[in-house]
Structure formats: C-alpha cells, structure tokens
C-alpha cells in the first residue's frame, strides 16, 4: 500500500515570493507522483514545478495558485493511487490601482457646495486600511468640512468648495506590505471670480513675412483682465507696442495678431488672465519661424532585375517637420502597386529594366521646398560582342585576346590563365574594353585563358586555347667567345627550337671542313684532344623547313689552364717587420695576377708606400700593422678562365726575451725573419 | 477477483470516431489508474495513456494526444477511450489495464472503407 | 523517449531447456523493467516487474536479472505451457515503452 510521510497542509503565502507544498510517499515499488489543482493535472512551468514529489514555487501567483492542490501517487505495477490531504494557499497581497471620482458620474457634474466622492483602487488581501492624502497632506477624519473613512475606500466631501481642490491620492497597507495610488485625481472647483481658461493659445508655425495669431479667452465673475506680454515680459498692447512688436494687435477678444512676422518675433507668448480674486492664470504659446534645411545627396544605386529595392529619403529638418514625396519622370509616385511609396522610403518591387531613371525625393512645408535626384541603374546580365577565341600567336611578339561585352552598369572583365587570376604587370594589360594583351609572347603562355564578365546582375564566361606560335631560336643562344683546355677533351653544345624541331649542323668560319678528329654530334661540337690549330671561328647552323635558317658566331680559343707554380703560405710576422706573400702562376695565356686582402681587391696603382706587387706576383707588407691581420687572396686570370687562392696573415706583438733564453733561441711560432 | 470486461470488436470508416468501454470489478473502481494501449503488427506496443478514475485527469502520450480522449463514469466503474477521425493506421487492438497487473480482453478496431 | 530494443524476436526450444531473452534501453532506466506473456485467448499475464521482483503467482523458473540499460528473462526447464509471445517493456516514466516482442515456440 501506498503511505504519504510527509503530506501537503495550508499555509500563508506572499504574492510573487516561493513557497513550497511538500509529499513524500513510501510504496513497495516505483510510485508515480502527480499534482492536481481543483483536480486538474498541474503542468511544470519554469514559475511552478514538481521538485522530487513536492510541488515548488518559484513565485506565488495569486489567480494561478489560488484552488485546492492535492499530491496523487500512483503504484504502476497495481495500479492503486493514493492521494493526500488538501492544501490551498492563503496569498497576501496587495496592488496599486487609480483614484476616480465615485460621484458624481462626471467631471462635468461638478459644482461648488455639491457633494464629491473619491474612490480607491488599491486592492488586497487581507482588506488593507486606507489613508487619504490631498496636495502630499495626509487627511483625517472630519477635518476641513470633509468625512474619511480609513476602514472604507472612499473619501467623501461635502459640500465641496473651492478650497477642495487640489491633487488626491491615496495609499494602503496590509500584512504583505504597502502600495500608493498609480494615478491620482485632480479636483479642481472653481470659485466664479477666479480666472478660468475658455480658449488658450496653441503653438503657431508661420513662414517669414507670414501673418500669426494667438487666440485667449478666460471668463470669471466679474469679467477678469487679459493681458499679453512677450519673452522679455513686454507687456504688449494696442497703445504700447514694444518696438520689435509694431505690427502686434490685441483684439477685444483677446486674440494677439502678428503681421510680417520676422525672426526676432520667434519665441515665448504669454497671455495673462487675472479674476477679482485668486492667482493669475498664465497660458503660453510659442511663435516658430518655419525652417527648411537643405536635403543630404543620393549615391547612384544599382540594382538587379526581379529584386525588390528601397531607397530612403532623409527629409530634411525643418520646422514644421517637412512632408517627403517621390516622383518619377514629373509624376508623384502612388503608395500602392509595383513602385510606390511607403513612408519615406521608394519601394521597387520585382524590378524591371524600364526602372531606370532618376527618381526625385521632394520635402516640402511652410518654409519652402527642397529636391534631391537619386539615379537608379537596373543592372543587366552582360551579352557577348565578341568572344574569346583560340588563338595562336608569335613568340616575341605581341598577342591579343578579345572579350567585347555589353552590359549595364558596364561590365567588368577579369581574365584567368590556367584557373589563375591574371594581375596586370609588365607582360599582361586588361584593356577597357576587356582586351587582354600579352606583351612578348613567351612559350608557356601557350595554355587555356578564361575571361570573365560581370555586373551586379549576373556574369558570363568564355575561355580560348592560346597556341604559341616558336621561333627559331637558339636555346641557349652560344656564348660568341669559349675557351679549350690544349691536350683535353672539349665540348662545344649548340641546341634550338623552333615550330618544327631544327637541324643543327657547325661549320668553320671560312668555309672549311672540320677535321677529323672533331665530330658534330647532334649540335655537339667534340674535341678528342684539343689542338693548337682547333682555335678559330665556327658557325652553328640551325634551320627547319618553315623558318629558314640562323647563325650563331662562335671564337674558340685554345688556352693552357692555370697552374699555380707557388701558393701563399699561412704567414705570422711581427709588428713593424714586413711580410711577404709568394705567390706564382703559369698558363696560356699567361695570366694576369690580382691581390684580395680583407675583402676588397689591392689595386696597384693605389697600394701606397706599405704595399707592393712584384712581377713575378709576390706581395709585400713594409711596416706591417695589426690591422694588416687578415685573409689575403692571389688570384690569377686570364682570357680563358680564373684561379685563386689563399692565406691568412697574422700579425703579432714582439715578445720580450727572457734572461734564461740564450741568444739563439728560436720563436715560439715560425716567421719571417726580415 | 479483479476483471476488467472491454467492449466489443468495432468496424469503421475512416474519418468516423469510435468510442471503446471498459467495466472494472472486483475492487474499488476510484481507487486505481486505469491505463489503455494499443497493439498493432506494425508497432508493437504503444502506451496511449492513464485515466485517475477519482478525478478524471488524465496524463496521455504526446503520440495520441488529439486522437484518443479518456473518460471515466464512476458511477458504473467504467473507463472510456473514444478515437477520433479514424485512418487505416488506426486499425489495431486496443487494451485498458489496471496498472501493469491486470489487463483486458482487448478491443478489435479495424478501420475499413 | 526510451526506446527498447528485444532480442531474439524469435526463438525455438525444447521443453526441459533453459532460454533467455534480452532487452536494452536507449538511455538507463535504473531496474524498472517488467516482463509479459501474452497467449491466445487469454489475457497478457505479468511475470516480472522491477526487473527481478516476481509477480505473485507466477512459477520460480521464470527470472529476471539486470539494471540500467542491460535485462535479461531467463525460462529454466521450459514447460509445454510457456511457449508463447513475451513482451518486455520499461515502467521508469511516461510513456511506458515496449519491446518488440520474442515467439517462443516448441522445435
């Protein structure tokens, strides 16, 4: 059987703060817990949830939570149920409500020395007590002529005079707190000789030079006085006008006239009404001058066909607030159909290519007129003019590939190259009219091209094969002067290219046949062992059946390599001693010797006093420095090729001897004794 | 002992609702949940919901809400499931039980033109 | 909701053996699985709830094992009379879900 331990009970509440309504069954098995409501299943809300088998509350609504809760459990596998003891919340609570006139019916209805009543709706539980307040006074009972009742929510006076009137509010409290009136009752009752309002001015707008009129009436027994003053609180009458007011009249019904109204009439009107007794009753108006600023410019727009598009007009400012239209063509635009006007905004719906145009923004009030043009472009899909087509084109020379559109706006053509966009540099330019020149066809420009034409609307592409058309040409072209080391193997290589692969043959310079000893293999020009008589001018001839045929001047020079017959020797000499570094070189033609030392070639003819290079190649340092320390290089050249080598000079303090060093004593290091 | 005697077969047209009984005796009828389920080849099955016969709420799966509508008549110990707007996936016996203990008979429902 | 998933949905046996029948849930449902034998003509009988606790009346060689998604029904020494449809079917929440369902017959 199913047994609650803990079961639900009663208990007060306060609106809007958490509760709880606790169960907790014990059952053999898995029990079902549920909550009913006046015996309808309560569903979780964020505000009400079950929390284990209580029932939690996050905050107590008095009309939601008000009713009788019971906790249901139910054992699935018998299906008995069990349910708890009732419980219900006594919620306390209090709301704000306004003060309204209970009697008489109407505002209208009120007149002195009749009774008023005064209700008020602050509601709660438990029954709050009530206190009345006129003008922030508390109020008590039976004081000034009036009835209070606190237990009551109405205050009632009678009679009710002029001295009543004033601002009535009220508050209440309870046990769950405290709440004042959310709108509160003026009573206003009037004594006949106080200055009452019959017409009061209103704000005028005018345009400059513009006639403005104020309208002011009060009525009291006996008649009040009106009187007009203006900012500088100049009182304004038909005798004495101020003398920015000339054109000022004050009419037997108290409305004020303004003729020609200027800028300096802009501003505060005040018309003044003062019965035998009571307070004066001041009304004011103001005076503005109209004013139109001019309007912000429009960006062209573009836009695509089929789109729905709005252009916003900003009016400008102005007082009073301009009214904005559309206009096309001279025609106001409707605020219906397909373009049309909505609010400020032009409306384009499923736009046509016969939108184009300019549209006019027009903003208008007393002060004038202002216009702004907005042009409207309906972008097209670009058409062909003409494509690119597959083209073939000389090496060396300029080629051109064509991409004539037409479109608008007009398009804009970008050119691809094997799926890569093409930046324009020196070798590439993008005409304006979507031409691509390819300045110095090269070879592997021979691939796809692919240009691209594009508008808002849309875009078109075509791509063409681009076929190079080779020169006939050396690859690489000879070098005109080579040199052959005497007695060894040579090679002399001659290739080229062209649309049909070429022939290539040598020949010597005169004329002659080569000997035997030399074969042309292929464009290969070989030497087994080179002679002194190989030396002389040959010509690579190569030639194809569609070009011809070219040349290519060759000198060959037979030569005795370098050798170094004596190298510099890694040198340590004393500071102030001089240095010597040998060095010799032997080739044909003889070779010329050059010096490097730290870096920078010792030219001979700027050495100085310190410096000198022999004939036969050899450098000597006078007087050598530690800044002279330092890696020193021979190179030897001649026409057919270079050599060099190299060594370190180090240039050291000289030591003190020691007395146990005999005179003869070697140095700790080998030099050169100078 | 506990019985639980449900009504007949039904055949019906589509669109038409039908409204199925079951009679519980040998113990007090307000004292237990009274659950219904369907049975179909398709399905196996599916639990349509429970009816507390004390107060009459119900608590039904989301599945069936809308076409099933659990009644009780405590006065004759008599639990009701009425289907609405009747299709061929429909077509199925449909079982009351009390708790997991006790079951019905069943009720054959075939929907058919 | 839970799914549940039965395992064999058909099995064939001979009497005096022991089978045994799986079901797992799609997300743990503590030990509140219950066990049913549905017959012709007769009305489906509750062997096993609470996924071991056996229902009153029923014989001893029915059994029930298991606990969060994994549950087992075990027949030992079938009897010519259990060979019938067994349904498993999860008592954690609403709505109660079922297997599909396993058919034992005789081989």
């Known amino acids: 059987a199913i047994v609650f331990i803990k079961q639900p009970s009663s208990q007060d509440a306060l609106q809007g703060r958490r509760a709880l309504l606790r169960c907790e069954v014990e059952a053999p098995g898995l029990v079902h817990v549920y909550w009913l409501l006046d015996g309808a299943p309560v569903q979780d809300t964020e505000r009400r949830f079950t929390q284990g088998s209580s029932l939690s509350f996050a905050a107590v609504d008095r009309l939601q939570d008000s009713g009788t809760f019971q906790c249901v459990a139910r054992d699935d596998v018998t299906g008995e149920e069990a349910r708890s003891a009732n419980a219900s919340f006594n919620i306390k609570w209090i709301e704000a409500g306004p003060v309204v006139l209970k009697h008489p019916a109407s505002e209208a209805e009120i007149q002195p020395q009749t009774q008023v009543t005064l209700r008020c709706h602050i509601d709660g539980h438990p029954r709050p007590t009530y206190q009345w307040f006129r003008d922030g006074t508390p109020l008590s009972d039976g004081q000034s002529n009036n009835t209070v009742s606190s237990k009551e929510r109405n205050l009632t006076l009678r009679p009710a005079g002029p001295e009543h009137s004033g601002l009535y509010s009220c508050c209440a409290h309870n046990a769950f707190g405290q709440a004042c009136s959310s709108q509160n009752f003026t009573l206003s009752i009037a004594d006949e000789s106080f200055a009452r309002v019959v017409l009061a001015p209103q704000d005028v707008i005018v345009a400059r030079n513009e006639e403005a009129m104020f309208h002011c009436q009060f009525s009291a027994q006996p008649p009040p006085n009106l009187q007009w003053l203006f900012e500088d609180e100049t009182p304004i009458t038909n005798r004495s006008r101020p003398p920015h007011l000339r054109r000022a009249t004050v009419f037997a019904n108290g409305s004020l006239l303004l003729t020609q109204v200027r800028p300096r009439n802009a501003g505060v009107y005040r018309c003044i009404g003062q019965g035998q007794r009571g307070p004066p009753v001041i009304l004011e108006a103001t005076l503005h001058l109209a004013e139109i600023e001019d309007m912000p410019l429009f960006e062209p727009r573009v836009f695509t066909a089929g789109s729905e598009e709005r252009v916003t007009c900003l009016p400008p400012k102005g007082l009073p607030e301009p009214s904005v239209w559309w206009e096309h063509a001279g025609v106001r635009l409707p605020t219906h159909g397909r373009v049309y006007q909505k609010g400020h905004e032009l409306v384009l719906a499923s736009i046509a290519e016969s939108d184009a145009g300019v549209y006019t923004c027009h903003a208008a009030n007393l002060a004038g007129q202002r216009r702004q043009d907005v042009n409207i472009t309906v972008a097209t899909v670009p058409t062909w003019l003409k494509k690119p087509q597959d083209s073939q084109l000389e090496e060396g020379k300029p080629g051109y590939l064509h991409c004539l559109t037409q479109a608008t706006p007009k398009p804009t053509v970008v050119w691809y190259r094997n799926q890569m966009l093409i930046s324009e540099d020196s070798r590439f330019e993008v005409f304006k009219n979507g031409t691509l020149r390819i300045n110095n066809v090269e070879v592997y420009d021979g691939t796809w091209y692919r240009c691209v034409s594009s508008t808002p609307a849309g875009s078109i592409e075509a791509q063409a094969r681009v076929q190079v058309l080779e020169k006939l040409k050396f690859t690489p072209p000879p070098q005109p002067q080579q040199c052959m080391e005497f007695d060894k193997e040579a090679t002399v290589p001659c290739s080229a290219t062209g649309r049909e692969k070429p022939t290539i043959k040598w020949e010597r310079a005169d004329g002659s046949s080569l000997p035997e000893w030399v074969t042309d293999n292929a464009g290969t020009l070989h030497f087994a062992r080179v002679t002194r008589d190989d030396a002389g001018n040959y010509t690579c001839i190569a030639s194809n059946g569609p070009q011809g045929q070219i040349r290519a001047h060759v000198q060959l020079t037979v030569a005795v390599f370098i050798t170094f017959k004596v190298e510099p020797e890694r040198t340590t000499v004393y500071q102030g001693h001089t240095a010597l570094l040998q060095c010799e070189a032997q080739g044909d033609p003889k070779p010329l010797i050059q010096w490097k030392g730290k870096d920078r070639i010792l030219d001979p003819t700027k050495l100085g006093p310190r410096m000198h290079i022999f004939q036969n190649g050899s450098l000597v340092i006078h007087d050598v420095a530690p800044e002279d320390s330092g890696r020193y290089t021979c190179i030897a050249g001649n026409s057919c090729n270079i050599k060099h080598t190299e060594a370190p000079l180090y240039v050291v303090d000289k030591p003190v001897p020691e007395e146990s060093e005999g005179p003869g004593s070697p140095p700790p290091y080998k030099m050169i004794q100078t | 002992q506990v019985q639980l005697q449900q009504s007949g077969a039904e055949l019906v047209r589509p669109g038409v609702s039908v409204k199925i009984s079951c009679k519980g005796s040998g113990y007090t009828f307000t004292d237990y949940g009274m659950h219904w389920l369907k049975q179909s080849h398709a399905k196996s099955l599916e639990w349509i919901g429970v009816?507390?016969?004390?107060?009459?709420?119900?608590t039904y799966n989301q599945k069936f809400k809308g076409k099933a509508t659990m009644t009780v008549d405590k006065s004759s110990s008599t639990a009701y499931m009425e289907l609405a707007r009747l299709t061929s996936e429909d077509s199925a016996i449909y079982y009351c039980a009390r708790g997991m203990g006790y079951w019905g008979q069943g009720t054959s429902v075939t929907v058919s033109s | 909701d839970v799914q549940i998933t039965q395992s064999p949905s058909y099995l064939a046996a001979s009497p005096g053996e022991t089978i045994t029948i799986n079901c797992r849930a799609s997300?743990?449902?503590?030990?509140?699985l219950a066990w049913y034998q549905e017959k012709p003509g007769k009305t489906n009988k509750l062997l096993i709830y609470?996924?071991?606790t056996l229902q009153s009346g029923i014989p001893s060689r029915f059994s029930g094992s298991g606990s969060g998604t994994d549950f087992t029904l075990t027949i030992s020494s079938l009897e010519p009379e259990d060979f019938a449809m067994y349904y498993c079917?999860?008592?954690?929440?609403?709505?109660?879900?079922f297997g599909g369902g396993t058919k034992l017959e005789i081989k």
């Open positions: 609470s996924g071991s």
């Open positions: 079917q999860q008592h954690n929440e609403y709505p109660w879900t």
């Open positions: 997300q743990s449902i503590s030990k509140y």
């Open positions: 009816i507390s016969p004390y107060y009459g709420d119900v």
